[in-house]
Amino acid sequence: TGADTEAVVCAGTACYTAHWGKLSAAEAQNLCLQNGGNLATVKSEEEAQHVQQVLAQLLRREAALTARMGKFWIGLQREKGKCLDPSLPLKGFSWVGGGEDTPYSNWHKELRNSCISKRCVSLLLDLSQPLLPGRLPKWSEGPCGSPGSPGSNIEGFVCKFSFKGMCRPLALGGPGQVTYTTPFQTTSSSLEAVPFASAANVACGEGDKDDSQSHYFLCKEKAPDVFDWGSSGPLCVSPKYGCNFNNGGCHQDCFEGGDGSFLCGCRPGFRLLDDLVTCASRNPCSSSPCRGGATCIPGPHGKNYTCRCPQGYQLDSSQLDCVDVDECQDSPCAQECVNTPGSFRCECWVGYEPGGPGEGACQDVDECALGRSPCAQGCTNTEGSFHCSCEEGYVLAGEDGTQCQDVDECVGPGGPLCDSLCFNTQGSFRCGCLPGWVLAPNGVSCAMGPVSLGPPSGPPDEEYKGEREGSTVPPAATASPTRGPEGTPKSTPTTRRPLLSSDAPITSVPLEVLAPSGSPGLWREPSIHHTTAASGAQEPAGGDSSVATQNDDGTDGQK
């Protein structure tokens, strides 16, 4: 066979050619276009392998280059004014011949974020190394070059030509040479598939003898999607060789007659095609024996078949039909598994959300996290749940147990807490005394005071009604008990005594604010918001002064 001068690979329904040339991307595209093609697409790993094969052919035809790295244009470009789009596999680039964006990509490195200039893609090759099938050339993005200035390391380009279909290469039954001329003006004698509309020139004979015959064939569409040369029987047959030369040009079996003639035949499960050379499988799948979305796979020699199911399905007992696989049987999820047709999904229990290491993992939802706590006061996160708590002087309330309600200590089950008057406040209480009596230092008892005709001492003045958070400690003829929000440790003795501020003035209260409530001598205070330390009150003087505070992370801490 003569040495091919051009690099060409044909497979599927396309041919790829590789060329040397320090050209801009536009010049390279024009050369491909002149022959009816475009700069090559690389839309799949399979196509990347075809492109690599044609580049390997090109490199074999040329001595090793001095340059180590070389670049070859392919048909991936991003127009001027279109920005890089990192969310897409092609990053905003598109194939020059049109066609859909595909998920396959093989970028050399992270792309630069640009919008202004047109950008073009080349395949980056180490020209000093042989191209290995496992290491497909990487995609390199850069300027598209201009005439006379192709860009750094640009060595050539790859074209792609698409066809309706392909013919099998012609097989010779005796000495001879086949030369194919493709529609894209490439000549080759070693194509694994020959594109539709190619011409085959067959020269039979040893070459140096006068007995050479010439045959000319065209690859035609004989029937829809059936491509054939229109030749009949092996070419260049010679009685001298019989079946000994290239198996007589037969695809499978070659049978010799006594007179030096021979015939081609096929193995069981195959049939001889009209060219009397090629064998095709007697397709056991033609009767569509597989059901339920199963694919029929012909067995060897066309004798039998197997049915194959899509992912997530398996064959039933008949081995012909597909049924859903219950993936949940294998417990692939951390918590809940829901089987779906052909697949499954993982779900998390209430109080958990997807996350954590591994597929289908769940992690606890921190219901108490900053800004999301459902509790009115204290919140404690637990695995898969949470619970609310209330400061001392409040109890959990509400249907869902997230609210806090004030405890009225003045009507508590333990009996009167104060010797005389008792004033309930938000989260606390205070003691007071009737006119003529003053509150003893213990904040609970009353002692005889200077004779006075005024109202009882104790409840706050009208001006304190509805007092705001952060206000000063109200008049201290009343006192607050030592406890949680006002500072007591949780181990406060059960006999609680209110705190009395040492510098608080003793004030009188208009009689109309006093109204009998409950047993004689027990009085209720008008609705007043008593500021606790947690909401900005001053720290009470005297007694225990431990104050509940809140840390940056939203947790409670002791100051």
């Epitope: 001027k80 004014g81 279109k82 920005c83 890089l84 789009d85 990192p86 969310s87 897409l88 905003g92 630069r112 974020n113 640009s114 919008c115 202004i116 200039s117 047109k118 850069g142 300027p143």
Partner: antibody, heavy 115, light 109 residues
Framework: QVQLQQSGAELVRPGASVKLSCKAS????????MHWVRQTPVHGLEWIGG????????AYNQKFKGKATLTADKSSSTAYMELRSLTSEDSAVYYC????????WGQGTLVTVSA | QAVVTQESALTTSPGETVTLTCRSS?????????ANWVQEKPDHLFTGLIG???NRAPGVPARFSGSLIGDKAALTITGAQTEDEAIYFC?????????FGGGTKLTVL
């Protein structure tokens, strides 16, 4: 680290021209576009244009075509913007910013156009 | 020329999540608009936060994220901090030019 050092403040007469510079360091100058933005109290931030130092390709806001010219000197890793036929409306702080994602910004150059 | 609209001001509290949006007068914002988000702090200090819709710039804390929400570009700050108080600008690309929004003044109280 990446730095964009802009030239100092300019006081110019109406009708005159001025050339602002933006010296890049800490990265390969030709790897990223350089964009120019201006800020005024009236119009806020306005994109003027951008240049690809590798190819010299430019893009301009229609409003600034004829007003601004962008250039880049690869040897000194410096981008330039020339503003011409200045009026009081061109008084602003002018910024250079690296790449089409505006990741890094210069400190700005105050241009005051006054008679 | 297209008009890009942002909330003029937003207020949030430390630890809260806040989302700033960026609307285009020409229709839905898509990834081809390559939305950029820039932070301006006092003294004209600009920092790029997000480029190309959802790519965090080098050194930008993970609490900043970019996305498309409905027909708008969005910048979300998950767990805002007091130092995030600033003016935030978005810029959208329209085939051959960028257009900036008017900026959102974010207050973190």
């Amino acid at each position: 680290q990446v730095q964009l050092q802009q030239s100092g403040a300019e006081l110019v007469r109406p009708g005159a021209s001025v050339k602002l510079s933006c010296k890049a360091s800490g990265y390969t100058f030709t790897d990223y576009e350089m964009h120019w933005v201006r800020q005024t109290p009236v119009h806020g931030l306005e994109w003027i244009g951008g240049i690809d130092p590798e190819t010299g390709g430019t893009a301009y806001n229609q409003k600034f075509k004829g007003k601004a010219t962008l250039t880049a000197d690869k040897s000194s890793s410096t981008a330039y913007m020339e503003l011409r036929s200045l009026t009081s409306e061109d008084s602003a702080v002018y910024y250079c910013t690296r790449g089409a994602w505006f990741a890094y910004w210069g400190q700005g150059t105050l241009v005051t156009v006054s008679a | 020329q297209a008009v890009v609209t942002q909330e003029s001001a937003l207020t949030t509290s430390p630890g809260e999540t806040v989302t700033l949006t960026c609307r285009s007068s020409t229709g839905a914002v898509t990834t081809s608009n390559s939305a950029n988000w820039v932070q301006e702090k006092p003294d004209h200090l600009f920092t790029g936060l997000i480029g190309g819709t959802n790519n965090r710039a080098p050194g930008v804390p993970a609490r900043f994220s970019g996305s498309l929400i409905g027909d708008k570009a969005a910048l979300t700050i998950t767990g805002a901090q007091t130092e995030d108080e600033a003016i935030y600008f978005c810029a959208l690309w329209y085939n051959n030019h960028f257009v900036f929004g008017g900026g959102t003044k974010l207050t973190v109280l």
